[in-house]
């Protein structure tokens, strides 16, 4: 197993409907063509996947039937968007990088995106 | 109405191991999000861990993650919770919860879960 640089943003505000978006970008040593990326959070003393996708190089992300996560890639960039956050989901948001293949197999694990998430205020009664 | 039956408890040493069983029933399973969470008198009920509809996602409570292991059989009905290397300070009710929106969520909260079994003892000596 050989080390990876991941690179991510260090705070992401989620949209008022719960939508978060961030880049991983990872520093690829050498012609990988199958990548998996794994989202995972680290809060409130849990350690949780979000989502995982498996992708061959130049072609979309599949992410697993649970995914609350899309998103694309782009040369050695990955775009990242989860949906339906709550408050409570606010946390560090960690982006795992594997390149399975060809051998050999390498490692990347970014510092983490602290997603902050608002939920909206209820609309007040209106007299209209 | 889906229905939660743990077993596997009991009395271990430290250092020993146990696994817990989980059996559902009454509703698709492989639609429905489960999770173990652990209580001990006095205190609220833990969470302990969570896995996905298809088991390819799981969430551990932080101390725990290396020791224990969640698992699903959906053909099976069942979700399973090894431990390992197990401490006095495990020693609590374990409760098997049912999400049955079946969304897996960042964070895992005892309050997304509406349906528990009764709870199996597991007592964990010095």
């Known amino acids: 197993c050989k080390a990876m640089h991941v690179a991510q943003p260090a705070v992401v505000l989620a949209s008022s409907r719960g939508i978060a978006s961030f880049v991983c970008e990872y520093a690829s040593p050498g012609k990988a063509t199958e990548v998996r990326v794994t989202v995972l959070r680290q809060a409130d003393s849990q350690v949780t996947e979000v989502c995982a996708a498996t992708y061959m190089m130049g072609n979309e992300l599949t992410f697993l039937d649970d995914s609350i996560c899309t998103g694309t890639s782009s040369g050695n960039q990955v775009n990242l968007t989860i949906q339906g956050l709550r408050a409570m989901d606010t946390g560090l948001y960690i982006c795992k990088v594997e390149l399975m293949y060809p051998p050999p197999y390498y490692l990347g694990i970014g510092n983490g995106t602290q997603i902050y998430v608002i939920d909206p205020e209820p609309c007040p009664d209106s007299d209209f | 109405e889906v229905q939660l039956v743990e077993s596997g408890g009991g009395l271990v040493q430290a250092g020993g191991s146990l696994s817990l069983s989980c059996a559902a029933s009454?509703?698709?399973?492989?639609?429905?999000?489960m999770a173990w969470f652990r209580q001990t008198p006095g205190k609220e009920r833990e969470f302990v861990a969570a896995?996905?509809?298809?088991?390819?996602?799981?969430s551990y409570a932080d101390s725990l993650k290396g020791r224990f292991t969640i698992s699903r059989d959906n053909a099976k009905n069942t979700v399973s919770l090894q431990m390992n290397n197990l401490k006095p300070e495990d020693t609590a009710v374990y409760y098997c919860?049912?999400?049955?929106?079946?969304?897996?969520?960042?964070?895992?909260?005892?309050?997304?879960?509406?349906?528990w079994g009764q709870g199996t003892q597991v007592t964990v000596s010095s």
């Open positions: 919860a049912a999400d049955t929106n079946g969304r897996w969520r960042p964070a895992i909260r005892p309050s997304d879960f509406e349906i």
């Open positions: 009454g509703r698709t399973f492989s639609s429905i999000t």
């Open positions: 896995i996905s509809r298809s088991g390819s996602l799981t």
